[in-house]
């Protein structure tokens, strides 16, 4: 913690300026008072200050404001920002989509990816969800950032605003958050045709259930097989060798160097060594031919 | 203060039915993804069900079929509906928060005990 | 489904030593596309529910004392207790959430030595 000193009176601060730079960290301390600091925020970014300084400043509006930062201050926060810890953000309440554009021009190039991440919880829990706007805003300032909403809050996404997402901003989203998000794309997109509509929910099918999944293996979608390997395993392990076939089309071939990786192994477990074999690429690992296939999970159903 | 409180359990023969509550305080149920933890006596954990915010349910394969899952949002309380109870479904039932709907859990209730036995 | 196994089931320390909890998947949890693992780590003491104590594999939960740490990617986790104290005694699971449904390890009872 910064030592307490009194300020000398040659050294009083009337206002936030450039002088400041050749304050050292205890004289900022002591001469800098916090609510001028506040009221002032929007000069802070413009004075090329130390990181030790920063320090600082961090520190005084922590005290002033131990329950979070007004918006006021928050949007004004230029480098600052770099100097917050999640912990800090979490105690925000952010509304305008203003200050989440400020904030992630000053994260971009710098590891801050916790602070990203709930930078933008904040935003969407200060505005109710994740409208049309907010995520447009980070399709345009933070690509690849809607995955770092947590299912949760993605649960409150409106099917209206999956439009506006663009593939490449789904590449990080994990198996529970596409499992929250397909079957808002899939109302969102039920009035395309099925060529346009594969197009759009391709993306989004690691979230899709097998029945789902059965129904485009009829539709000569030819899945590539990217995307076959980003499907839930749970989705996928029922599939029969002709249905997995037809889905992917002429990407079939594709499975033979996906073979030892899930869900393409697992899948190979569960199926046939004859139905495997007419595949023509070699898969090995399949129910031997002759076993006979219990399948409990009905048995339990029946009783 | 978040707290969930089970009740419900009790002893109940083979074939029987049950049903488990979980009242919540502290947070509103419709908004996160709940989920039903048991644990036999004197073995491990093992995941039952999980209700996402927006409805979306899944069970464990042991489960399914026979067990249901469910809230109502006015009580803010979350329900497991479990049919043709069979002796191995004998546990301590937890209710627990499924952290942010990723998938690990960061509040449990105590535990209501159900034993299945004739 | 993904099977999860603990190494040793049992463990005796003395207070002040470290622990250490192996934790092994039968398939990788780490997500390649935003490189996060799927794992978490709880504590459970008798009669209690288990306690959430470290998630995405080496994140604290806040309030869990900075002695205990979680490590590994893939398939090989470790749970730290760098310096056992009397209240660590009790039985700690490991758990994956990168797939439905979300399986726990068979746990690991620590004890004092």
């Known amino acids: 913690d910064v030592e307490r000193t009194t300020c000398p009176p040659e050294k009083e601060v009337h206002e936030i300026d450039e002088n400041l730079i050749f304050y050292k960290k205890r004289e900022l301390e002591a001469c800098v008072d916090a609510a001028l600091l506040a009221a002032q925020m929007d000069r802070v970014d413009a004075i090329p200050f130390t990181y030790e300084q920063l320090d600082v400043l961090k520190h005084k509006l922590d005290e002033l404001y131990p329950q979070g930062y007004p918006e006021s201050v928050i949007r004004h926060l230029g480098h600052l920002f770099l100097k917050m810890s999640p912990e800090d953000i979490r105690k925000w309440n952010v509304t305008s989509l203003e200050t989440l554009k400020a904030l992630l021009k000053v994260s971009k190039g710098h590891e801050m990816s916790a602070q990203v991440a709930t930078l933008i919880d904040r935003v969407v829990v200060g505005r109710g969800q994740l409208d049309k706007d907010t995520a447009d805003t980070l399709t345009a300032f933070c690509p690849g950032c809607l995955c770092s909403l947590s299912p949760e809050r993605l649960s409150s996404v409106p099917p209206s605003v999956i439009g506006a997402v663009r593939p490449q901003d789904l590449d990080t989203c994990g198996p529970r958050q596409l499992d929250v998000l397909y079957p808002k794309a899939r109302l969102a997109f039920q009035n395309m045709s099925g060529s346009e509509y594969f197009v759009k929910i391709r993306p989004f099918l690691g979230g899709a259930p097998t029945e789902d999944l059965k129904a485009l293996s009829q539709q000569n979608v030819s899945m590539d097989l990217a995307t076959f390997m980003k499907l839930r395993r749970e989705a996928v392990l029922p599939l029969t060798v002709a249905e997995v076939q037809k889905l992917l089309g002429p990407h079939v071939e594709g499975l033979k160097v996906e073979e030892q990786h899930s869900p393409v192994r697992d899948w190979i477990l569960k199926q046939r060594q004859d139905d495997l074999d007419t595949l023509g690429l070699g898969l090995q690992g399949g129910i031997p031919n002759g076993y006979l296939i219990l399948d409990l999970s009905v048995r339990e159903a029946l009783s | 203060e978040v707290q969930l409180v089970e009740s419900g359990g009790g002893l109940i023969q083979p074939g029987g039915s049950l049903r488990l509550s979980c009242a919540v305080s502290?947070?509103?149920?419709?908004?996160?993804?709940m989920t039903w933890v048991r644990q036999a006596p004197g073995k491990g954990l093992e995941w039952v069900s999980v209700?996402?915010?927006?409805?979306?349910?899944y069970y464990a394969d042991s489960v399914k079929g026979r067990f249901t899952i469910s809230r109502d949002n006015s009580k803010n309380t979350l329900y497991l509906q479990m049919n043709s109870l069979r002796a191995e479904d004998t546990a301590v039932y937890y209710c627990?928060?499924?952290?942010?709907?990723?998938?690990?859990?960061?509040?449990w209730g105590q535990g209501t005990l159900v034993t299945v036995s004739s | 489904d993904i099977v999860m196994t603990q190494s040793p089931d049992s463990l005796a320390v003395s207070l002040g030593e470290r622990a250490t909890i192996n934790c092994k998947s039968s398939?990788?949890?780490?997500?390649?596309?935003?490189?996060?693992?799927?794992l978490a780590w709880y504590q459970q003491k008798p009669g209690q529910p288990p306690k959430l104590l470290i998630y995405?594999?080496?994140t604290r939960e806040s309030g869990v004392p900075d002695r205990f740490s979680g490590s590994g990617s893939g398939t090989d986790f470790t749970l730290t207790i760098s310096s056992l104290q009397a209240e660590d005694v009790a039985v700690y699971y490991c758990?994956?959430?990168?797939?439905?449904?979300?399986?726990f390890g068979q746990g690991t009872k620590v004890e004092i030595k």
């Open positions: 627990a928060r499924d952290s942010g709907g990723w998938g690990y859990f960061d509040y």
């Open positions: 209700i996402y915010s927006g409805g979306k349910t």
């Open positions: 758990q994956q959430y990168y797939s439905t449904p979300p399986t």
């Open positions: 995405w594999a080496s």
């Open positions: 502290g947070f509103t149920v419709s908004s996160k993804f």
């Open positions: 398939q990788s949890v780490l997500y390649s596309s935003n490189n996060k693992n799927y």
